[in-house]
Interface confidence: low
Amino acid sequence: HNTTVFQGVAGQSLQVSCPYDSMKHWGRRKAWCRQLGEKGPCQRVVSTHNLWLLSFLRRWNGSTAITDDTLGGTLTITLRNLQPHDAGLYQCQSLHGSEADTLRKVLVEVLADPLDHRDAGDLWFPGESESFEDAHVEHSISRSLLEGEIPFPPTS
């Protein structure tokens, strides 16, 4: 499996899509797991509804949601309020019994929001600071800094 990169904005939501053959994986539940180390186990983060027919219902575990379009063959994972510690290697999985097939390997990278600033001429980018402010968002790439939140340091 090749690894697909998804680059999301800190404090916002990132949507990861995992396409699959809907006939081949018919009747199978899906899961999203985080790879622990290069050759380590994949730790389950969230899985689709226990009843496969209800896989379209969004299930949350903390700030991570999963929903499955079983007819169209697309598993969608939403990482809400993306933070630097969310960066890493993940997998979309198709479950059958105690086994799991990898649908897609995903590398999540967290970028800074170019609109998180007070001076409109400045942008802030990766590598310039370790600190991110928490933000509450519902949609991917859909908002800028809330009034009262502390802006990132500007580009030097």
Partner: antibody, heavy 120, light 108 residues
Framework: QVQLVQSGAEVKKPGASVKVSCKAS????????IHWVRQAPGQGLEWMGI????????SYAQKFQGRVTMTRDTSTSTVYMELSSLRSEDTAVYYC?????????????WGQGTMVTVSS | EIVMTQSPGTLSLSPGERATLSCRAS???????LAWYQQKPGQAPRLLIY???SRATGIPDRFSGSGSGTDFTLTISRLEPEDFAVYYC?????????FGGGTKVEIK
């Protein structure tokens, strides 16, 4: 399908302003950043700035600071780029471009471009 | 401002040949903040690669990107007639986003 449709070509005199529009369709307008990039005749690409259509927040390249204004109208899913105090070196094709959700600082869907000619 | 330098300026090759395009940044842009675009005359650019090596949606696998730090490469494994165009790299690590001057791939 997903597309960005820009307004037509403009001819302006030095010192004047130009306002280019970019109408989005085929996707949720407020969920993707829009950037503006220009290209002078026979030259390379130059990034001008970015707007978040959801809140209207903007950030501009320092070079254009004070001369460029990016706005949006969510009711018509349209983004605008206004450049003032035009000079001959502003003659270029101006593109609006959408950022994909996989990587919000690159440009996967582009408008067809608007040619702006600045000439006395 | 990070300056992006592309080489060669022009690459003359025949269909079926392998094309290797180079892009160098004036300072490190890490490993994941570089994109490649293709532009044909009279058309808007088309995103090929982002994150230095991830192909954009619908891009054929004959296009591949590699590199990190300051040196990046776009490789077209076997040139098709439709691949003859100008190619630009772009960094998005630091403000402002900047593009290279472009490499023109022309038919030999």
């Amino acid at each position: 399908q997903v597309q960005l449709v820009q307004s037509g070509a403009e001819v302006k005199k030095p010192g004047a302003s130009v306002k280019v529009s970019c109408k989005a369709s085929g996707y949720t307008f407020t969920s993707y950043y829009i950037h503006w990039v220009r290209q002078a005749p026979g030259q390379g690409l130059e990034w001008m700035g970015i707007i978040n259509p959801s809140g209207g927040s903007t950030s501009y390249a320092q070079k254009f600071q004070g001369r460029v204004t990016m706005t949006r109208d969510t009711s018509t899913s349209t983004v605008y780029m206004e450049l003032s105090s035009l000079r001959s070196e502003d003659t270029a094709v101006y593109y609006c471009a959408r950022a994909p959700q996989e990587s919000p600082y690159v440009f996967d869907i582009w408008g067809q471009g608007t040619m702006v000619t600045v000439s006395s | 401002e990070i300056v992006m330098t592309q080489s060669p300026g022009t690459l003359s090759l025949s269909p079926g040949e392998r094309a290797t395009l180079s892009c160098r940044a004036s300072q490190s842009v890490s490993s994941s903040y570089l994109a490649w675009y293709q532009q044909k005359p009279g058309q808007a650019p088309r995103l090929l690669i982002y994150g230095a090596s991830s192909r954009a949606t619908g891009i054929p696998d004959r296009f591949s990107g590699s590199g990190s730090g300051t040196d990046f490469t776009l490789t077209i494994s076997r040139l098709e007639p439709e691949d003859f165009a100008v190619y630009y790299c772009q960094q998005y690590f630091s403000s402002p986003f900047t593009f290279g001057g472009g490499t023109k791939v022309e038919i030999k």
